[in-house]
């Protein structure tokens, strides 16, 4: 060994100075008599070494590094040897910080593993090997007086938690607990916790289960769930309070909390939920009223609430077949009575024969909003209900009676926009209870089965805006029937368009006779088209060679026209314009020439 380094301290605070000396022995004969000692930190040469020959002939170089800013580096003492640098000795330098005070020390008693688990935050990186030890002692009082020490708990490398096993614990008695952190630059200790392990017990949550339906128990009400829970075995005799949380599986709803519930309730009916909805539920518990920690939330239980019977009003309307008055077509519309009126699975129309107590004969069962059935000869009334798995709506009676009430008057209709029609009337006297308004395509496309209908509950209404199934350029038949206590009035009807179309083309002009100063024209009118309003008039236009224009307005029933006052032997351009309230259309242009003065008239 030719050289040897010694340092003031191999481990220092990061940024602190460090002094090192390197001594080269005299007996290294292969060296220069006056060798120059060089210093290297890591890969970098360090200037500032002060070299001297000592009395015993050895060479010494001393260097002070003003700031050691590397957390770990090798300091080497070297000599130039030929073209290369020869390392004589090297030492490892480390720099870092003393341990910060560990903070946020907390402990949980785990009754499953029968151990006290403590965890802490170690604080900022020290850059040095730092050991943590969980220290504790038993204490009779509030930890002011120290009892038996408990064996130190040393966490595995890199972990910031440690378990004190049951054999070192004394339950229902205080323990002093703290963490000690130690490295080459110092020692620090966390603030001491004083706790009874049972006061930091963390329970496991109960296991949620659905209640097995028992034959004698009433089924849950709509919007309710019946559930029960199995308490966690190790906590059977620990007083706890629990809370339940639930949310619908679908949608973005947040958890709703229910509690506190006593653990020993063991079963619970949760109400106020949406009917026929799948919910996710969880439960958690805490030792109470004594101190403790909340358990984690239990695994989820997924349950569906029962649905409620439909809560709807059924507006009804009926029609008899003209050829067979006992065949009735019944129509209805469900009107929700509450925000959540329940799912409707289907509808039943039934009849109860008089004198047969309890006997109900179904006439039809359907998912549609209408049905056709044969009305028994003695039946004057049927009942209609909506149903689902939870039950039926209140029955709606439908009475089949003659039209004995007064009729409404002055029924009229007008377009509001291309997709709506206003129908108005003068109410009869006395006021009806309401009206049924029906509408559908008028002739030739009219069909009883394709009519839309609405119930107007206000008997004082004088009109109704039809917004459903209204399209432009279609002729609609609108039928309004007044409804009275036990009867109805006669139906009235009116026809209307929500928007009419201009004529698609004007009739073709034909020349019938021509003379020197006149021309007789004729045309065949276009047949009326559905959705097109009737013609109001024609206008005939003619233009001479000098581009002078003339016109005449003719009524809609015209089939021809004679142009007078024409110039002989002159060219004329003529066209016909057919007009309705919805617009006008021009025919193609007819060009003709009047006869020369010496020519004979053409007929």
């Amino acid at each position: 060994e030719c050289g040897h380094i010694s340092v003031s301290a191999p481990i220092v605070h990061l940024g602190d100075p460090i002094t090192a000396s390197c001594i080269i022995k005299q007996n290294c004969s292969h060296l220069d008599p006056e060798p120059q000692i060089l210093w290297r930190l890591g890969a970098e040469l360090q200037p500032g070494g002060r070299q001297q020959r000592l009395s015993d002939g050895t060479q010494e170089s001393i260097i002070t590094l003003p700031h050691l800013n590397h957390t770990q580096a090798f300091l080497s003492c070297c000599l130039n040897w030929g073209n290369s640098l020869q390392i004589l000795d090297q030492v490892e330098l480390r720099a870092g910080y003393p341990p910060a005070i560990p903070h946020n020390l907390s402990c949980l008693m785990n009754l499953t593993t029968s151990s006290l688990i403590c965890q802490w935050e170690p604080g900022p990186e020290t850059h040095l090997p730092t050991s943590f030890t969980l220290k504790s002692f038993k204490s009779r009082g509030n930890c002011q007086t120290q009892g038996d020490s408990i064996l130190d708990c040393v966490p595995k490398d890199g972990q910031s938690h440690c378990c004190i096993p049951r054999k070192h614990l004394l339950l229902y008695q205080n323990m002093g607990i703290w963490v000690q952190a130690e490295n080459a630059l110092g020692t620090s200790m966390s603030p001491q916790l004083c706790l009874d392990p049972m006061d930091v017990v963390k329970l496991e949550p109960p296991m949620l289960r659905t209640m097995d339906p028992s034959p004698e128990a009433a089924p849950p009400q709509a919007g309710c769930l019946q559930l029960c829970w199995e308490p966690w075995q190790p906590g059977l005799h620990i007083n706890q309070k629990c809370e339940l949380r639930h949310k619908p599986q679908r949608g973005e709803a947040s958890w709703a909390l229910v509690g506190p519930l006593p653990l020993e309730a063991l079963q619970y009916e949760l109400c106020g939920l949406l009917p026929a909805t799948a919910y996710t539920l969880q439960i958690r518990c805490i030792r109470w009223p004594l101190p403790g920690h909340w358990s984690d939330w239990s695994p989820s239980l997924e349950l569906r609430t029962t649905e409620r019977a439909p809560t709807v009003r059924l507006d009804t309307w009926w029609r008899q077949r003209q050829l067979d008055p006992r065949t009735v077509q019944l129509f209805w519309k469900p009107v929700p009575l509450e925000e959540d009126s329940g799912r409707i699975q289907g509808y039943v129309v039934s009849w109860r024969p008089s004198g047969q107590a309890g006997a109900i004969l179904p006439l039809c069962n359907t998912t549609e909003l209408s049905c056709t059935f044969h009305l028994p000869s003695e039946a004057q009334e049927v009942a209609l209900v909506a149903y689902n798995s939870a039950g039926t709506s209140r029955p709606t009676p439908v009475v089949f009676s003659e039209s004995r009430g007064p009729a409404l008057t002055r029924l009229h209709a007008m377009a509001r926009d291309p997709h709506s029609l206003w129908v108005g009337w003068e109410p009869p006297n006395p006021w009806p209870q309401g009206y049924v308004i029906e509408w559908g395509l008028g002739p030739p496309s009219a069909s009883n089965s394709n009519k839309t209908w609405r119930m107007e509950q206000n008997g004082r209404a004088t009109g109704f805006l039809l917004k459903e199934n209204i399209r432009p350029f279609q002729l609609y038949e609108i039928i309004v029937t007044p409804l009275y206590q036990d009867t109805m009035g006669p139906s009235q009807h009116v026809y209307a368009y929500s928007q009419e179309m201009a004529p698609s083309h004007a009739p073709e002009l034909h020349l019938k006779h021509i003379g020197k100063t006149w021309a007789q024209l004729e045309w065949v009118p276009e047949p009326p088209e559905l959705g097109k309003s009737p013609l109001t008039h024609y206008t005939i236009f003619w233009t001479n060679a000098q581009n002078q224009s003339f016109s005449a307005i003719l009524n809609a029933s015209s089939r021809g026209f004679v142009l007078h006052g024409l110039e002989p032997a002159s060219l004329y351009h003529i066209h016909l314009m057919a007009a309705s309230q919805a617009g006008a259309t021009n025919s193609t242009v007819l060009t003709l020439m009047t006869l020369t003065p010496e020519g004979s008239e053409l007929h």
Partner: antibody
């Protein structure tokens, strides 16, 4: 200091009924499970029944199920054991006990003797 | 239900002896095992709870160990006042059965 005082024991004919009471003091009665343990003459200890702090959970030993009913009145700090259809094998000293959170019988009363004999 | 088997049912020992009583559960009960001492004509007294925790006021010569199904009560140096019957009891379930008892007598 915790004290438990049983009463209501005595001689009863087979098929008869008896109601034991246990008056508790020195602790917050409504926070603890309570229980009954019996000991037949010259025999070991036998757990009979226990009751949760608010009375919602009441497990029983198979030997007494359907015949005995445990109950409590937290306002009176009293535990009860209603014993019906008594049999000779129910003859024992009945102890009232306060349970700890980990299910141990923390404190015991002095016991009351029930003798079922014709 | 979890049954408890205690052994021996009786033993004779001298003052100063180390005495060991065992208790076996028919299935795992974690640490939910308690030991009681009963002297003739007296109510039982809790010695050890949760397998190894000494009840307040109980001398430190009594100790408990074990977990799962096998448990032990040890009296390190038997004293005259320790001659009594000892019972184990599980509290893992609602049905809290006792062992059959071990009678410790003077040799």
């Amino acid at each position: 200091e915790v004290q438990l005082l049983e009463s209501g024991g005595g001689l009863v004919q087979p098929g008869g009924s008896l109601r034991l009471s246990c008056a508790a003091s020195g602790f917050t009665f409504s926070l603890y499970w309570m229980g009954w343990v019996r000991q037949a003459p010259g025999k070991g200890l036998e757990w009979v029944s226990s009751i949760s702090s608010s009375g919602g959970v009441t497990p029983y030993a198979d030997s007494v199920k359907g015949r005995f009913t445990i109950s409590r009145d937290n306002s009176k700090n009293t535990l009860y054991l209603q014993m019906n259809s008594l049999r000779a094998e129910d003859t024992a000293v009945y102890y009232c006990a306060k349970l700890g959170e980990l299910g141990m019988f923390h404190k015991w009363g002095q016991g009351t003797l029930v003798t079922v004999s014709s | 239900d979890i049954q408890m088997t205690q052994s021996p049912s009786s033993l004779s020992a001298s003052v100063g002896d180390r005495v060991t009583i065992t208790c076996r559960a028919s299935q795992g009960i974690s640490s939910y095992l308690n030991w009681y001492q009963q002297k003739p004509g007296k109510a039982p007294k809790l010695l050890i709870y949760y397998a190894s925790n000494l009840q307040n006021g109980v001398p430190s010569r009594f100790s408990g160990s074990g977990s799962g199904t096998d448990f032990t009560l040890t009296i390190s140096s038997l004293q005259p006042e320790d001659f009594a019957t000892y019972y184990c009891q599980q509290s893992w379930e609602y049905a809290m059965f006792f062992g059959g008892g071990t009678k410790v007598e003077i040799k």
